[in-house]
């Protein structure tokens, strides 16, 4: 019951997280005009990953897409890539995790397969969350660097009569959405990985006997066929205890089969 709850909660948390990553990626407010010196402005600028916008005091908002690909900063391209990779991995993870949910029965799918799928989706969520956090952090770092550069520019070359207003940008709402969403996806992924431990099938004594009888030949090991499909449960020669309890390093053996994730 606890396993099902952990798995279900992990799925829901990851779902919210991925929805947040998608929202953050689409949002226009990745960077917003710094209003420190002028809290009420007649023209307010903000920028996203895909377009920049200007909101006038009149209430009119004009947004323009970045129609160039080669002319954009490499960092912005990198952030876009990280966010898209995060979304794609998250979406695949969600798809896999739906089939892995213990409360959903699909044909004669065995628990070992569900365990492996749960682990796969968990790892995908973790990587997805890390991609989002990395993307947002790279953008935030870019903003901080530009902020101090433009601040330095504001106080130079003002010897003449005419002053030029340098627009400085600070953190937009999308950054916070991205950080939170990435964190949630990461947490959801960890929960799925934890749930995976309790989902592995409880081997019977009969199977254990059968296993010992087969000696050390991998070909005749229980779950050997399943292992070849990528959804096996016991790939090491370990003693299977009554009641299905497992040793610590047996649990650690799971990720070794998921290098393809």
């Amino acid at each position: 019951m606890a396993v099902t709850a952990c798995q279900g909660l992990g799925f829901v948390v990851s779902l919210i997280g991925i929805a947040g990553i998608i929202a953050a990626t689409c949002m226009d407010q990745w960077s917003t005009q710094d209003l420190y010196n002028n809290p009420v402005t007649a023209v307010f600028n903000y920028q996203g990953l895909w377009r920049s916008c200007v909101r006038e005091s009149s209430g009119f908002t004009e947004c323009r897409g970045y129609f160039t690909l080669l002319g954009l900063p490499a960092m912005l391209q990198a952030v876009r890539a990280l966010m898209i990779v995060g979304i794609v991995l998250g979406a695949i993870g969600l798809l896999v995790s739906i089939f892995a949910l213990k409360c959903i029965r699909i044909g004669s799918m065995e628990d070992s397969a569900k365990a492996n799928m749960t682990l796969t989706s968990g790892i995908m969520f973790i990587v997805s969350g890390l991609c989002a956090i990395a993307g947002v952090s790279v953008f935030a770092n870019m903003l901080v660097t530009n902020f101090w550069m433009s601040t330095a520019n504001m106080y130079t070359g003002m010897g003449g009569m005419v002053q030029t207003v340098q627009t400085r940008y600070t953190f937009g709402a999308a950054l916070f959405v991205g950080w939170v969403a990435g964190g949630l996806t990461l947490i959801g992924g960890v929960m799925m990985c934890i749930a995976c431990r309790g989902l592995a099938p409880e081997e019977t004594n009969y199977k254990a006997v059968s296993y010992h009888a087969s000696g050390h030949s991998v070909a005749y090991k229980p779950g050997g066929f399943k292992a070849s499909t990528g959804f096996g449960s016991n790939t090491k020669n370990k003693k299977i205890y009554d009641g299905g309890a497992r040793t610590e390093d047996e649990v650690q053996s799971y990720p070794s089969k998921h290098d393809y994730v």
């Epitope: 402005t41 023209v43 916008c53 005091s57 009149s58 209430g59 009119f60 207003v165």
Partner: antibody
Framework: QVQLVQSGAEVKKPGASVKVSCKAS????????MNWVRQAPGQGLEWMGN????????SYNQKFKGRVTMTIDKSTSTVYMELSSLRSEDTAVYYC???????????WGQGTTVTVSS | DIVMTQSPDSLAVSLGERATMNCKSS????????????LTWYQQKPGQPPKLLIY???TRKSGVPDRFTGSGSGTDFTLTISSLQAEDVAVYYC?????????FGGGTKVEIK
Amino acid sequence: QVQLVQSGAEVKKPGASVKVSCKASGYTFTGYNMNWVRQAPGQGLEWMGNIDPYYGGTSYNQKFKGRVTMTIDKSTSTVYMELSSLRSEDTAVYYCARMYHGNAFDYWGQGTTVTVSS
Amino acid sequence: DIVMTQSPDSLAVSLGERATMNCKSSQSLLNSGNLKNYLTWYQQKPGQPPKLLIYWASTRKSGVPDRFTGSGSGTDFTLTISSLQAEDVAVYYCQNDYSYPLTFGGGTKVEIK
């Protein structure tokens, strides 16, 4: 067509308050900010502030801060501008003006003359 | 506050001739976000409220004759009446629409020579 109709002329004593109204018609009232601009006799234009009829948010010229209050009545599509602690230098024609693209004022009221005299 | 300075104070031009007036701001009115200059030109005739001619420094409001042209960027702007008509006699104001408080120039009075 868009129309901004202002209240009639006012004569006030120094220290008193005046409340000028501006009734809008011919467009979606809450879709455009309303500004107030005054013009002293023979002088130039001076922006006083504006109000967002949708949210009710205001921006005032610091020069009038504390003396000017802008309010709205959505039910009648009317904007009000109240100026308190009147002085003789507040004698002017007060205009309401609708804010348009580029923060420009595309439609203006006919003006309300406020005379401050003892 | 952004200070708007208009020149000349008055301008006498013959009918059909070109009239040019200038407006200078103490700070740039160019917004980096959309590369638009937040400067507006108004025409005011005696006893009337101002009338919007040009916004974003060079965009003519619909219904405004094409003899009115706005130009300039940053801090220096110009309003040109290519062929002055009798009905163009008025005071012309420029306005900073970029930063609060919104400020107006002192005006340029256009008369017929």
